[in-house]
């Protein structure tokens, strides 16, 4: 539990002390306190580096002090022969005796009190971004006019986050532009636009000045774009660095400017405007668009046709054609579906006749049709050759989609008769 | 047949045998048979068969029987009540519905019906086959298919010849320009048991086919001339016949 | 006179080879089946194989299938037969036959053919 | 395939006798059916085709008979030149089959 003071004696003190001892006392005030040890009495067997007896005085894995021999004050108005003040509200303090004294040695008496530590001073890191504030226990920062302290109650910064912006078109600047921006401030700008139009950024070179990079190329300040899971940025330095047109493909923008303490420029300035959300023109084969476009956007609806000989091969049976709209996230609906080479199917067998089996039975493909010769002739005509036509009919120059038939050949016997010869 | 030779089917594959009674016939096409009048108007679901040379039982076991759907005698053709004392064969064609489709191949093929033309109007001396099953010079039947070639002839070379075993006067026979007279030539002639069978002539247009230009019909006498149904004059009946009952398939 | 021939028998040993033939004359020849009958020394007729007229048909006994080859040549007049893979049950006395309507009707002389090692 | 059965297979007659040769068929033959006559080292010669026609040239003493499988083989008046094998023959399907003979002597 921590104590505003006490009292720390070597054992037996003030008789002497025994050998072969090692005591530790822990000493912790109340937070915001330091502490303030002093020695008011100090005989302790003397030895180089004070090797033999000690008492050590420890701040977290810092040595403070390590003590031994005899002491006395300087003052004669103050029993103080030797004393520590330390910034922090915990301190060890551990005495040690080794297994001989050749004298007789009462070893020591020590003091100690929680002290004020002046926070906004006493350390070489300044806890205040702008103003320190010290009091008994403690310190708080603040902030200048039209600043804010952040939530780490350390850091001020602008309030400079929170807008939502929705319009189609709009501009947007760094805090006090063209005035230097505020140090240490993180700003978030949202923009928001309807589903199926995507935020496109523009900036002038000329209209960019934010601190430079360090020599690690890391920005100090930076401008960062971040539209889904793509991120344009971080962007630094005097006149933009990044694409003058920046197309995120997103109807969702956050726009982040960060700044450190120091070098502030004048900052930026941008516009930006909702587009369409463009929907590629994909290369779909075997098909043509209705309307044909340059670029197709949001809403944008095109009816897809197969070429002779292609049909859809998802959803209506035989289907020749399907629409297909340009969606608010930039893909066309449908896509899934595709224009596929018209199927024929295996063809139709006929009586005393055979057709081979074809290699494919796709559109543009051909087969023959033969009658079993010499015995049947094909008598419709047509030579019995049928392409899969785009109808997914196997069709045939003269007959169409008629099928051949095979006819007996009539009179023809397959032997001669021979008369006899008389 | 008399005076004929030995045949095979290969060299006849239109040749149907009739066994009740035992004729001759010609297939035409996938389900139609031609053949003479007389023979199915005793037996209008008469057994059919093809592709066999002989005509021994067993043979025909292994050959391919057809089955009658309907028989269609021509119209013209007039029934008696006592067919023996016939003396009038005009009109003697009929065509038979098969049940079911014929398969073509070496032994079974059919025969060409004439064409319409003059070019199908047959010459004194035109040569014709005939072949069957029938009374040969040693037989009253014979089991292995036979045939003859014989020339066509003046109809009077038919009415000359004393009809050999007459059921009335000889001035009671018909012959009409239905008719063809054929033989004479070396006694080679059709004969009792081959009736129905074509005679086959040489196509004018494509000399690789025969066509049926008659049908074994009658005779004065066997081994002398014959008399066949002339079916050139009766193309219209048989296309007509063959349109009215097929079945959608065919047409 | 119808006249036939038979030639070309004699002694082989078993699984050799002979072709008999038969001459035909004093008639047409091109218009009859033909048959090769064999008789066994001592023993019945055997009928063996039958050709068509033109040799397009032929049917061949269960006991010679796959071994004897018949086969004819019109323009000569002429019967063969093929015998390969000869057996000693094939020795016989080889006929060659003229076939009217299934009766053999005239018949050669005979050839008579020895199987033996 | 079908069996011939000849019987009986010899037989000793007198000139002049009636001589009957009989065959069976292991199955329905109809009249398919031929009779030969083979002399001591000689070709075999057609008598009788269809079981009861006289081949042309061959005299009328010999006849056949029968249909399905029974036949019958005659000679009314046995001559001394009638001394033979005689074998019958049927044609119903391939394989063409023959009786196993009859051997006719003089007594």
């Known amino acids: 539990e921590p104590t505003m003071y006490g009292e720390i004696l070597s054992p037996n003190y003030p008789q002497a002390y025994p050998s072969e001892v090692e005591k530790s006392w822990d000493i912790e005030v109340p937070e915001g306190y330091g502490i303030h040890l002093y020695f008011t009495h100090l005989d302790i067997e003397l030895s180089e580096n004070c090797a033999y007896d000690s008492v050590q005085i420890i701040s977290g894995d810092t040595e403070e002090g390590r003590l031994c021999g005899q002491r006395s004050s300087n003052n004669p108005h103050s029993p103080i022969v030797e004393e520590f003040q330390v910034p922090y509200n915990k301190l060890q303090v551990i005495f040690k005796s080794d297994f001989s004294n050749e004298e007789r040695f009462t070893g020591f008496a020590a003091y100690y009190v929680a002290t004020d530590i002046n926070e906004c001073t006493d350390f070489v890191d300044v806890p205040c971004s702008h103003f320190c504030n010290n009091f008994i226990g403690g310190y708080f920062c603040s902030c200048p006019p039209e600043y804010f302290l952040h939530d780490d109650m350390k850091n001020c910064g602008v309030n400079c986050s929170g807008d939502v912006f929705t319009a189609l078109i709009g501009e947007i600047a760094s805090p006090n532009y063209p005035k230097p921006y505020p140090e240490n401030s993180r700003c978030e700008y949202q923009i928001r636009l309807e589903k199926g139009f995507q935020v496109v950024v523009t900036l002038r070179r000329e209209d960019f000045d934010v601190e430079a990079a360090d020599s690690a190329g890391n920005c100090l300040d930076s401008l960062v774009f971040v539209a889904g899971d793509r991120q344009f940025g971080p962007y630094c330095g005097h006149g933009f660095p990044g694409p003058l047109n920046i197309e995120t493909k997103s109807n969702a923008l956050d726009i982040i400017f960060q700044t450190d303490l120091t070098g502030q420029k004048k900052g930026w300035k941008l516009r930006y405007h909702g587009d369409p959300m463009p929907c590629p023109k994909e290369d779909t084969p075997n098909s043509v668009w209705e309307p044909a476009k340059a670029k197709y956007v949001f809403r944008d609806v095109v009816q897809i046709t197969c070429l002779d000989g292609f049909e859809v091969v998802e959803g209506r049976v035989g289907a020749t054609s399907f629409y297909s709209t340009c969606q608010s996230n930039g893909k066309w609906s449908n896509s899934k579906l595709k224009c596929q080479p018209v199927d024929c199917g295996i063809p139709e067998s006929i009586e005393n006749g055979k057709v081979e089996d074809p290699e494919s039975t796709l559109f543009g493909s051909v087969i023959r049709y033969t009658c079993e010769e010499p015995y049947y002739y094909m008598e419709n005509g047509g030579g019995g050759e049928y392409h899969c036509a785009g109808n997914g009919s196997w069709v045939n120059e003269v007959l169409g989609p008629e099928l051949p038939k095979c006819v007996p050949v009539c009179g023809v016997p397959r032997e001669p008769f021979e008369e006899k010869q008389r | 047949i008399i005076g004929g030779s030995d045949a095979d089917i290969k060299n006849f594959p239109w040749q149907v045998f009739f066994d009740n009674p035992w004729a001759g016939g010609a297939l035409i096409n996938e389900y139609w048979v031609l053949t003479a009048a007389h023979v199915v108007e005793g037996n209008r679901e008469p057994t059919m068969y093809v592709g066999s040379t002989s005509v021994q039982t067993s043979r025909l076991a292994k050959s391919k029987m057809l089955t009658p759907e309907h028989v269609f005698i021509h119209p013209g053709w007039k029934l008696l009540e006592v067919p023996e004392g016939r003396t009038n064969f005009d009109n003697d064609i009929a065509l038979v519905r098969l049940k079911d489709p014929v398969k073509m191949g070496p032994t079974v093929s059919p025969i060409c019906l004439p064409g319409t033309s003059s070019d199908y109007n047959l010459m004194d001396g035109d040569l014709g086959l005939i072949s069957g099953w029938g009374r040969t010079e040693k037989r009253d039947r014979a089991v292995r298919l036979k045939a003859a070639r014989l020339p066509v002839a003046p109809l009077r070379k038919c009415k000359e010849v004393k009809v050999e075993k007459p059921t009335a006067d000889a001035e009671a026979y018909v012959f009409t320009p239905n008719m063809i007279c054929a033989g004479g030539e070396k006694g080679m002639d059709s004969c009792k048991g081959d009736s129905g069978g074509a005679f086959a002539v040489q196509d004018p247009n494509d000399k690789t086919k025969f066509y049926a230009a008659g049908l074994v019909s009658w005779g004065p006498q066997c081994g002398t001339y014959g008399l066949y149904t002339r079916v050139k004059n009766y193309v219209d009946w048989i296309m007509k016949t063959m349109q009215e009952n097929s079945t959608p398939r065919e047409d | 006179e119808v006249q036939l021939v038979e030639s070309g028998g004699g002694l082989v040993k078993p699984g050799g080879s002979l072709r008999l033939s038969c001459a035909a004359s004093g008639f047409t020849f091109s218009d009859y089946y033909m048959s090769w009958i064999r008789q066994a020394p001592g023993k019945g007729l055997e009928w063996v194989s039958y050709?068509?007229?033109?040799?397009?048909?032929?049917y061949y006994a269960d006991s010679v299938k796959g071994r004897f080859t018949i086969s004819r040549d019109n323009a000569k007049n002429s019967l063969y037969l093929q015998m390969n893979s000869l057996r000693a049950e094939d020795t016989a006395v080889y006929y060659c036959?003229?076939?009217?309507?299934?009766?053999?009707?005239?018949w050669g002389q005979g050839t008579l053919v020895t199987v033996s090692s | 395939d079908i069996q011939m059965t000849q019987s009986p297979s010899s037989l000793s007659a007198s000139v002049g006798d009636r001589v009957t040769i009989t065959c069976q068929a292991s199955q329905d033959i109809s009249n398919y059916l031929n009779w030969y006559q083979q002399k001591p080292g000689k070709a075999p010669k057609l008598l009788i085709y269809d079981a009861s026609n006289l081949e042309t040239g061959v005299p009328s003493r010999f006849s056949g008979s029968g249909s399905g499988t029974d036949f019958t083989f005659t000679i009314s008046s046995l001559q001394p030149e009638d001394i033979a094998t005689y074998y019958c023959?049927?044609?119903?399907?391939?394989?063409?089959?023959f009786g196993g003979g009859t051997k006719v002597e003089i007594k």
């Open positions: 023959q049927h044609y119903e399907d391939y394989p063409l089959t």
């Open positions: 036959a003229r076939d009217e309507n299934y009766a053999l009707d005239w």
């Open positions: 050709i068509s007229r033109s040799g397009s048909t032929k």
